[in-house]
């Protein structure tokens, strides 16, 4: 039975040109995390594999940085980055858990600074 839950950074509003940290944390399960995929719509952004480490999709290499932890840092944000992002936790023996974060990137100045979300 899947008992785990995913906690996310929550939805975020950010400024064009800035950077943002997307993070998820899987709790309430003893399942082993084998891989975490980060996706936007149907595009794979990055993979963090427990054995092989990080792989960033070539088309995002310039603007996506791994971490902190299992999270993902998006840099040089554009309005086109507005959308829903998914953290997909592949675990054994539970299976797959998915977290969802919506990111809104605005032209004008946005008062959201200083990420305080940390993986426990």
């Amino acid at each position: 039975m899947m008992t785990g839950t995913i906690e996310t950074t929550g939805n975020i509003s950010a400024e064009k040109g800035g950077s943002i940290i997307l993070q998820c944390h899987l709790s309430s399960t003893t399942a082993q995390v084998t891989q975490v995929n980060w996706e936007q719509q149907d595009q794979l952004l990055a993979i963090c594999n427990a054995d092989l480490g990080w792989h960033i999709s070539p088309s995002f290499k310039d603007r996506v940085a791994p971490g902190p932890g299992l999270g993902l840092t998006l840099q040089s944000l554009t309005v086109n980055d507005t959308g829903e992002y998914f953290c997909i936790y592949h675990t054994y023996p539970d299976g797959t858990y998915t977290g969802r974060i919506f990111l809104e990137v605005l032209e004008s100045s946005v008062a959201e600074h200083g990420a305080r979300f940390q993986i426990p």
Epitope: G10, N11, I12, S13, Q23, T82, E84, R100, E104
Partner: antibody, heavy 119, light 112 residues
């Protein structure tokens, strides 16, 4: 003045599909997210999903995945919601609502479209 | 999904009364950047819902100052001082911090 003008009431048969339109005016259509909300069972409000007119990106309430399909026509500043394989459970009033920038709220709402599913 | 619970379900009032509506969420509505996306709406019969308060306590343009919002974390309140006839209807809170956004069940403000 911001306005969202929705299409008129619909009476449709079970199993059919239909499309509701929401024409936006008074602001730059591509600058704001468009949400869709269902009002059913008297007073219950349920978020269906949203679309980003700028890039066509969508986000759905999983309860409506496969039930609702959201699109936009930027040239006419119109958002659309197609409802698929309708049943009596889909009889409701449907609203489009503009997203308030920075605050994940809904600042302007359409007048609502009443959908009745009946044979 | 985040569960949003509103109380009371029904609120009988007299004109001139001051009332409070409570909205509680099953998890914190503060995101990792310290922002809380909690808004309040009034839905009058035969009309569309209208935004009253966003970001916990910000009044939307044109909303009278007898409406005020407060709270943090999981516990939020809408206060209406000096109830007027045009304030009657269904009140809803909406959390927009977590996907999918979820509404409270509503509070019906009606005359005693």
């Amino acid at each position: 003045e911001v306005q969202l003008q929705q299409s008129g009431p619909e009476l449709v048969k079970p199993g059919a599909s239909m499309k509701i339109s929401c024409k936006a005016s008074g602001y730059s259509f591509t600058d704001y997210i468009m949400n869709w909300v269902k009002q059913s069972h008297g007073d219950n409000l349920e978020w269906i999903g949203l679309i980003v007119p700028y890039n066509g990106g969508t986000s759905y309430n999983l309860n409506f995945k496969g039930k609702a399909s959201l699109t936009v026509d930027k040239s006419s500043s119109t958002a659309y919601m197609e409802l698929l394989s309708l049943t009596s459970e889909d009889s409701a009033v449907y609203y489009c609502a503009r997203g308030l920038q920075r605050f994940y709220a809904m600042d302007y709402w359409g007048q609502g479209t009443s959908v009745t599913v009946s044979s | 999904d985040v569960v949003v619970t509103q109380t009371p379900l029904s609120l009988p009032v007299s004109f001139g009364d001051q009332v409070s509506i409570s909205c509680r969420s099953s998890q914190s509505l503060e995101n990792s950047y310290g922002n809380t996306y909690l808004s309040w709406y009034l839905h009058k019969p035969g009309q569309s819902p209208q935004l009253l308060i966003y970001g916990i306590s910000n009044r939307f343009s044109g909303v009278p100052d007898r409406f005020s919002g407060s709270g943090s974390g999981t516990d939020f309140t809408l206060k209406i001082s000096t109830i007027k006839p045009e304030d009657l209807g269904m009140y809803y809170c909406l959390q927009g911090t977590h996907q999918p956004p979820t509404f409270g069940g509503g509070t019906k403000l009606e005359i005693k």
